[in-house]
Interface confidence: medium
């Protein structure tokens, strides 16, 4: 059910493209294609190519993205395009000028002197933005989200975007300065992963990050299952980067117990993050006794 045909506006197309990209990434990383047939991988790649081509129709002259060409470009959506295209670049041919043009726009047009990324064109499909939808601590969570996207594009774009390392450092410094005052577990998790990517998730931030976990296994807000899956997935990625393999098993167990296999309204971020995190887990912890995921993927019938 994750391998779907992308369609619609610049936001809907990304909603459709997300699950296919992450499903292929997950099955590649965990070497599970034999369950579905290797020919299915090729079909999935065709859908990703289609999504990529369709998304280019929403690229504005500035290299940024919006739901429609007559709307102001969105910081969040452009960062998300960067994130998905960076992952897809391992699967299909992505024009680096397209990807790095979006990175350049984020840095030159949307980053303030204090390192914060600002949003001047909020997305229409608010259900696609996950835990960021809660307006509290939006500056930190958006800055962390963009920073993570920039880090994921770094290998491809560092040569084309001279200001990329400096931008990442500025954003990281802002997150560091704000981190100890964060209240939302979601923000603590996403910002914690952003810091971990910079090798800065150390004391006192590490203690705050770990202490925010409820019962040592989840970064949770009441009655927000999708946000909690997303947040805990960010946290798992941070723990894996830290090589804190003692803290990892209870987190993986909790994610596994959610029996969340993606898809459904409002699931874009939770789907992307849970499969990114579990793929990374199975790569970093090959002897993964804590994970027994019965994942099923369905290709659309032609």
């Amino acid at each position: 059910h994750l391998i779907v045909t992308p369609a619609g506006c610049g936001e809907q197309n990304m909603i459709g493209m997300t699950p296919t990209v992450i499903a292929v990434h997950y099955l590649d990383q965990t070497e599970q294609w034999e369950k579905f047939g290797i020919e299915k991988r090729q079909e999935a790649l065709e859908l990703i190519k289609k999504g990529y081509t369709q998304q280019l129709a929403f690229k504005q002259p500035s290299s940024a993205y919006a739901a429609f060409n007559n709307r102001p470009p969105s910081t969040w959506l452009t960062a998300y395009v960067v994130k998905v295209f960076s992952l897809a670049a391992n699967l299909i041919a992505i024009d680096s000028h397209v990807l790095c043009g979006a990175v350049k726009w984020l840095i030159l047009e949307k980053q303030k002197p204090d390192g914060v990324f600002q949003e001047d064109g909020p997305v229409i499909h608010q259900e696609m933005i996950g835990g960021f939808r809660n307006a509290k601590e939006a500056d930190v969570s958006l800055t962390a989200f963009v920073l993570i996207a920039l880090q994921e594009a770094r290998d491809i774009c560092e040569g084309q975007v001279n200001s990329l390392p400096g931008s990442i450092n500025k954003a990281g410094e802002y997150i560091e300065a704000s981190y100890m005052n964060l209240q939302r577990p979601y923000t603590v998790a996403i910002a914690g992963y952003a810091l971990a990517l910079m090798n800065k998730l150390e004391e006192p931030y590490l203690g705050k990050f770990l202490n925010t976990a409820k019962d040592r296994n989840r970064w949770e807000e009441p009655d927000q299952q999708l946000y909690n899956v997303e947040a805990t997935s960010y946290a798992l990625l941070a723990l894996l980067l830290l090589k804190d393999f003692d803290s990892v098993p209870p987190v993986v167990r909790w994610l596994n117990e959610q029996r969340y296999y993606g898809g459904g309204y409002g699931s874009t971020q939770a789907t992307f993050m849970v499969f990114q995190a579990l793929a990374q887990y199975q790569t970093d912890v090959p002897d993964h006794k804590d994970l027994n995921m019965d994942v099923s993927f369905h290709l659309p019938s032609r």
Epitope: G207, N211, R216, N217, S247, P249, P250
Partner: antibody, heavy 120, light 108 residues
């Protein structure tokens, strides 16, 4: 930084009792506080702790019978119900070492303790 | 609740010697373990937190190690003032935490 427990006394079984931990030199609005007890001649037993926002966490055996609450920025109460002779112990309060979870950063410093005796 | 098994329950060492105390958790507790020292008639004192981090003001002869389920407190170059009972406190979650049974250290 110092802590002091008060309220310990001789009570009969079933009598509720509230102990108070008073801190000086720091504020509970930024620090956590834990409770531990020790029966005469026995080892230490963890009861629970309260974070700076007032959320309390308990050892599973203490849930329901013990309640930790913040009375002010310098005092925390430990309310005990349904006391039995098994609850006879010295009760200690201790601050979280850094303001974080005392189970992660450890508890330091400690109060001198207050003795609760449950006897018929 | 996790069970923390401390061994030995009692040990002795000469001044300048080495003492090793082990704490085994019944389930993986990562690095969520602290060591405390208690002398008769006094409250406990924090020695080590997060399995291996030395608390402020604690002499460097105290060393904590381990993670997961196996932890060790080592006192190298034991001094007379180290005679005390030592406890580990492990935490699997906020509601699953327990002390070990204690180890009495006698200095000869």
């Amino acid at each position: 930084q110092s802590l002091e427990e008060s309220g310990g006394r001789l009570v009969t079984p079933g009598t509720p009792l509230t102990l108070t931990c008073t801190v000086s030199g720091f504020s509970l609005s930024t620090y956590t506080l834990g409770w531990v007890r020790q029966a005469p001649g026995k080892g230490l037993e963890y009861i629970g702790w309260i974070d700076s926002s007032g959320s309390a966490y308990y050892a599973s055996w203490a849930k329901g019978r013990f309640t930790i609450s913040k009375a002010s920025s310098t005092t925390v109460d430990l309310k005990m119900a349904g006391l039995t002779t098994e609850d006879t112990a010295t009760y200690f309060c201790a601050s979280g070492n850094t303001g974080g979870d005392p189970l992660y950063y450890g508890m330091d410093p400690w109060g001198p303790g207050t003795l609760v005796t449950v006897s018929s | 609740d996790p069970v923390l098994t401390q061994t030995p329950s009692s040990t002795s060492a000469a001044v300048g010697g080495t003492v090793t105390i082990k704490c085994q958790a019944s389930q993986n507790i990562g690095r969520w373990l602290a060591w405390y020292q208690q002398k008769p008639g006094q409250p406990p004192k924090l020695l080590i937190y997060r399995a291996s981090d030395l608390a402020s003001g604690v002499p460097s002869r105290f060393k904590g190690s381990g993670s997961g389920t196996q932890f060790t407190l080592t006192i190298s170059g034991v001094q007379r003032e180290d005679a005390a009972t030592y406890y580990c406190l492990g935490s699997y979650s906020s509601s699953d935490s327990a002390f070990g049974g204690g180890t009495e250290v006698v200095v000869k």
